[in-house]
Amino acid sequence: MAVTACQGLGFVVSLIGIAGIIAATCMDQWSTQDLYNNPVTAVFNYQGLWRSCVRESSGFTECRGYFTLLGLPAMLQAVRALMIVGIVLGAIGLLVSIFALKCIRIGSMEDSAKANMTLTSGIMFIVSGLCAIAGVSVFANMLVTNFWMSTANMYTGMGGMVQTVQTRYTFGAALFVGWVAGGLTLIGGVMMCIACRGLAPEETNYKAVSYHASGHSVAYKPGGFKASTGFGSNTKNKKIYDGGARTEDEVQSYPSKHDYV
């Protein structure tokens, strides 16, 4: 029961996390204009991974997509890649975990197969969460660097008369959504991995050692520790979960991973 709850909760937490990662990736407010010196602006700038926007005091909002690929900073491209990889891995993880849920019966799928699938999805969630956290953190670091650089040369004067005030950007809502979502996906993945341990049938398939006292000589029946070696006959043909290693009669098919980036 606890295993089912842990697995179910892990799935739900991961689902929320991945939804959050998708939301963060699509959001326009990755960086927002710093309003520290001027809390009320006529023109409010904010930027996302895919476009930058302006909200005017008139109430109108206009966005412009980044219609170039080569002209974009390498860091931005890297963040995009990390977020997309995170989403793809998370989506595949969700797909795998649906079939791995203990509460869902699919044909005669055995617990060991479900355990393996749970572990697989758990690892995928962990990597997905890490990708999102890494992506958001890289972007945040980029913002901090640019913030202090633009603060250092806040005004570039033209003969003292004309001032070009650089727009400083600070953390946008998407960063916090991304961090929280990445954390949730990570936690969900860990929960799935924990659940996978409980799903595996923990039976130690030891065979009894028979002692035949024939005089003073002691004879040991051969094949005494067959289960632990993985060789020899396994009469009940039970699959033994050993943290990912599989016995030879166990055929495990993993879904193929396609990264559509």
Epitope: A42, F44, C53, V54, E56, S57, S58, E62, R64
Partner: antibody, heavy 118, light 113 residues
Framework: QVQLQQPGAELVRPGTSVKLSCKAS????????VNWVKQRPGQGLEWIGM????????RLNQQFKDKATLTVDKSSNTAYMQLNRPTSEDSAVYYC???????????WGQGTTLIVSS | DIVMTQSPSSLTVTAGEKVTLNCLSS????????????LTWYQQKPGQPPKLLIY???TRDSGVPDRFTGGGSGVDFTLTIYRVQAEDLAFYYC?????????FGSGTKLEMK
Amino acid sequence: QVQLQQPGAELVRPGTSVKLSCKASGYSFTNYWVNWVKQRPGQGLEWIGMVHPSGSETRLNQQFKDKATLTVDKSSNTAYMQLNRPTSEDSAVYYCARVWSGNAFDYWGQGTTLIVSS
Amino acid sequence: DIVMTQSPSSLTVTAGEKVTLNCLSSQSLLASGNQRNYLTWYQQKPGQPPKLLIYWASTRDSGVPDRFTGGGSGVDFTLTIYRVQAEDLAFYYCQNGFSFPFTFGSGTKLEMK
């Protein structure tokens, strides 16, 4: 069509507060900011401030913060500007205007000529 | 506050010629988010309220003849009137829409010879 109607003139004694009106029609009043602009005879234009009819939010030029109070009456689609303790310096034409994209003022009232005289 | 400087203060022209009015801002009016310049041009005839001609530095308002063209970026802007007509004689003002308080230039008076 969009219209901003203002009374032609107001005569007021120095020190007596006056409330100028601007009645909007032909558009959704609560969707656009209403600006107030001052123009003294033979002078340029001076932005006083703006008010948003939906929540009565205001943005005021600091030079007018003690002089002007901007309000709206949604029921009558009217924006108001109250000028406190007017002096001869406040004698001018006061325009109300709607804010458009680019923070530009696309529709203007005909203006109210305020005469401050004893 | 952003200071808007217009030049010349007055200009005498003959019908049919091309006229260029200048507006200099003390600060860049370019918004990084949409790469638009928040500069507006108005025309004001005597006894009338100002009329919107151009916003976003180069976007003509509806109903404005195409002989009016806005240009420039950052701090330096121009309003060009091709083939000036008698009805174009008026005051022309530029306005900063980039930051509060919105500020206007002192205006350029267009006169006929």
